[in-house]
């Protein structure tokens, strides 16, 4: 088991500021937007735009807000109860299975295939074989036709931040 982390171990911006709002824990837990004090007697509010908590918790400090990477746009800012929501810029996408970075959408389909789905922040363009209608799952094709795609308009946010 790891040693207990104390407030002194935390970065200065994570330490409880004396002016932060306090309330009492309920059944040993603090509500979203708060963390518990080291002595367990108080719930201390998170700092807007700096940290957050989304659920009832017994965290010694709130979780740090995510900063959107370059290549991402901020859909909604970090609040005390919700992390930042970031989304890939137009023309790029992030797959659930490889969420580390936004990848460029392909500009067209391989020869013999037609585009049936646009580039969205969470998926590449979708290509199917002209004849069979089966999907193409390969990487960027060596030869592309002149079938081009314009970046899709996002219908809903794609967030890794929960």
């Amino acid at each position: 088991e790891s040693a207990l982390i104390t407030q002194q171990d935390l970065a200065p911006q994570q330490r409880a500021a004396p002016q932060q709002k306090r309330s009492s824990p309920s059944e040993g837990l603090c509500p979203p937007g708060h963390h518990i004090s080291e002595d367990g007697r108080d719930c201390i509010s998170c700092k807007y735009g700096q940290d957050y908590s989304t659920h009832w918790n017994d965290l010694l400090f709130c979780l740090r807000c995510t900063r959107c990477d370059s290549g991402e746009v901020e859909l909604s800012p970090c609040t005390t109860t919700r992390n930042t929501v970031c989304q890939c810029e137009e023309g790029t996408f992030r797959e659930e299975d490889s969420p580390e970075m936004c990848r460029k959408c392909r500009t067209g389909c391989p020869r013999g295939m037609v585009k049936v789905g646009d580039c969205t922040p969470w998926s590449d363009i979708e290509c199917v074989h002209k004849e069979s209608g089966t999907k193409h799952s390969g990487e960027v094709p060596a030869v592309e036709e002149t079938v081009t795609s314009s970046p899709g308009t996002p219908a809903s946010p794609c967030s890794l931040s929960g």
């Epitope: 790891s2 982390i5 979780l63 929960g162």
Partner: nanobody, 126 residues
Framework: EVQLLESGGGEVQPGGSLRLSCAAS????????VGWFRQAPGKEREFVCA????????YYAESVKGRFTCSRDNAKNTLYLQMSSLRAEDTAVYYC???????????????????WGQGTLVTVKP
């Protein structure tokens, strides 16, 4: 390969207690947050609790607040869920899960988790 194996489920009366365990066969267990989810018949899988990698601090769903406690033993690569004051609505298959990537401090949504156990059934009935 990540393997998660839950145990400790069973039938219990309302007001009773159970302790679930989840054994992980992955070397990175001690550096990753880990969570419990549950799925009742005909319902979607829902978040129960998640605990930080070092075992200090956890998130809890409002429905289990004050009744369930999430803990872990990194030396044994094991996650625990202590359940007390059980109710009929706690009847479900309980799953432990590891996130699909390691940089989310305390993920609490199904889509953020990529590795799942096979589940253990908890039935609460008189």
């Amino acid at each position: 390969e990540v393997q998660l194996l839950e145990s400790g489920g069973g039938e219990v009366q309302p007001g009773g207690s159970l302790r679930l365990s989840c054994a992980a066969s992955v070397s990175t267990f001690g550096t990753s947050p880990v969570g419990w989810f549950r799925q009742a018949p005909g319902k979607e899988r829902e978040f129960v609790c998640a605990i930080r990698w070092e075992g200090v601090g956890a998130y809890y769903a409002e429905s289990v607040k004050g009744r369930f406690t999430c803990s872990r033993d990194n030396a044994k690569n094991t996650l625990y869920l202590q359940m007390s004051s059980l109710r009929a609505e706690d009847t479900a298959v309980y799953y432990c899960a590891l996130p699909r990537r390691g940089d989310s401090e305390l993920p609490s949504t199904v889509k953020e988790y990529g590795y799942w156990g096979q589940g253990t059934l908890v039935t609460v009935k008189p």
